[in-house]
Amino acid sequence: KSSNEATNITPKHNMKAFLDELKAENIKKFLYNFTQIPHLAGTEQNFQLAKQIQSQWKEFGLDSVELAHYDVLLSYPNKTHPNYISIINEDGNEIFNTSLFEPPPPGYENVSDIVPPFSAFSPQGMPEGDLVYVNYARTEDFFKLERDMKINCSGKIVIARYGKVFRGNKVKNAQLAGAKGVILYSDPADYFAPGVKSYPDGWNLPGGGVQRGNILNLNGAGDPLTPGYPANEYAYRRGIAEAVGLPSIPVHPIGYYDAQKLLEKMGGSAPPDSSWRGSLKVPYNVGPGFTGNFSTQKVKMHIHSTNEVTRIYNVIGTLRGAVEPDRYVILGGHRDSWVFGGIDPQSGAAVVHEIVRSFGTLKKEGWRPRRTILFASWDAEEFGLLGSTEWAEENSRLLQERGVAYINADSSIEGNYTLRVDCTPLMYSLVHNLTKELKSPDEGFEGKSLYESWTKKSPSPEFSGMPRISKLGSGNDFEVFFQRLGIASGRARYTKNWETNKFSGYPLYHSVYETYELVEKFYDPMFKYHLTVAQVRGGMVFELANSIVLPFDCRDYAVVLRKYADKIYSISMKHPQEMKTYSVSFDSLFSAVKNFTEIASKFSERLQDFDKSNPIVLRMMNDQLMFLERAFIDPLGLPDRPFYRHVIYAPSSHNKYAGESFPGIYDALFDIESKVDPSKAWGEVKRQIYVAAFTVQAAAETLSEVA
């Protein structure tokens, strides 16, 4: 077929028609509709919303919309036996108890089924003991405590502030340090921006507000009972003792009013430096235990949550491609929320809904995309990316052969300052070109492009005149597509000014106060930032599904591979003597990167020149582009993390949210000076260099002329 046979209008006009159809007022209306009651995974309310979305996507004009269900392990508090933490005196009497629920926001006092704050998948238990304050509970915080301050957390209950890293990593670190319980709290230093009122008068966290969240360490496994395979009707489930990633000690989150009561009595060691002090009027003493007058008092946790196999529902919509129906571009975001989901996820789900409506409108006018577009409303993201992972496990053979790209669509906003994009290097040029065509919504940038405001506000640290684009980490539904299957992926949202706002995430994240009103009153009253995010996400999907040649530039991968090789080499060179002793060389990696660069350059030249009217050659070149991301997958996975298979990127072993480059080498080098067997440790570094060099070389060869 000719390149444009799929459409009844020119490609440029198609994109314009699609973008012009997106309306801020619709996104606002959809957000309101999605946020009036809680939609916790595994509940009837979230099932009803799945059916509503299925029905509306059908009305919008998609070819088919199906529910895909799975029975996965979820976690809920006990309704009659609430979780809380006490300070107990020497007689065991509870002299202070933490709150049982958050004070509901105005207008929501009579809403039922608001799940109280809890740490999902915490085991049951009632440990009691002395408290140790561990700052953010990062790897480096425990190094400071154990190595520098000689403080032993074994048998202690640790209290850690939220922020900086994924909460599951905090719990894992506490477990490894021997703690018998973990209390997580939100410090105003991280969740209260100066000069802003707390909700309902502003977007800051009130003292009674608490962040919910799962505390798993799944490393990409999906449902803890069925790693690698879908949790379907005939699934074989592991016993709970063999489940993947479950914490072994009780964990519970609290707000800063309650944290004040626990921390104000802390004794023992003073904080090691100012980076350990938050904004509460407490000494931030590390402990262990309470100070003089209160030294006989202890902390006791009361955790009664249960893990239950529960049915979840994804909504999968299909818009069949006219020319290449066997090539899939996927737009997915989750639907389940902790409570109302005003930002997470419904600001994203409302944008997806409007994107589906716009595509449906074009389809009703006779247009079809060149490639198939799949739309997904994922369930149980908050419980460990379960819905997306189970669906990808069920459809892995199709996806690895047909998956062109995955665009994630969780929260559209985490601020209203500028754009934030994390994606594969293959998409850099697509994002640059698209944002140059879109109008900036920012004040002071009227009539300017989104690219211009984004570049001004968030400049690239390496390349002047270009915006920052970050590595993909995890903590969201792109994980299985990118890290396990090697499908080119990207995400975009509006964010805060990271220079001036040092708090982690947005203050009301995963609290009861994440409401429609939070967005409508404080973040985006005109829904212009939501509209911009819809244009970016939708525009990316449109280009990926409709451009004749896939909008991937392999030369950008070459550039970052060199940067990442330089970075990991410089880390290794902090140990020059050992590198010499154990004959550690990065020559093979640098050689592979050089080969990749040369081959990518030649491929790009051929891409300019080939006969695009020849459908076989076009398909061949597009397949080389599509399969390039796949070529970075190692079927054996990373050490002890079999579902993280991408050799160039993986979630950091110390923070699931962050991406790490050459993660196999990085982890082999991490803290290598403390390893008991240096010969073995440096041997593993050499092995990881070998794996990385081989993978880069093998990927390069997929771009060579085929014969």
Partner: nanobody, 123 residues
């Protein structure tokens, strides 16, 4: 209109019991800590008891500890004070008072008061 209305006061013999109620209207009781405060004839105000918004913590003045129990029913928007083993020195006008801070874990300043209910303990 935002208001608190106390009831249940009366004359009672020493050693007997009484239960005071305080009905809130015009605002949701569920978000606020609540207090009972009393004023004996010719004396100043004395704080009696406090309960957090969620009922997880209760604090009492030493003079009533072990005898009085503060409780609440958020679904009924009502605060209670169960007074057992009453003594003549418990004679006072009892006021309920709303804590000013949403979600406070300890008593703070009060911003809404009831009109009070008189309790007389006399033989």
């Amino acid at each position: 209109e935002v208001q608190l209305l106390e009831s249940g006061g009366g004359v009672v013999q020493p050693g007997r019991s009484l239960r005071l109620s305080c009905a809130a209207s015009g605002f949701p009781l569920i978000s606020y800590g609540m207090n009972w405060v009393r004023q004996a004839p010719g004396k100043g105000l004395d704080w009696v008891a406090f309960i957090t918004y969620d009922g997880s913590n209760r604090y009492y003045a030493d003079s009533v500890k072990g005898r009085f129990t503060i409780s609440r029913d958020n679904s009924k928007n009502t605060l209670y004070l169960q007074m057992n083993s009453l003594r003549p020195e418990d004679t006072a006008v009892y006021y309920c008072a709303k804590d000013r801070i949403v979600g406070a874990r300890v008593p703070d300043a009060y911003d809404i008061w009831g009109q009070g209910t008189m309790v007389t303990v006399s033989s």
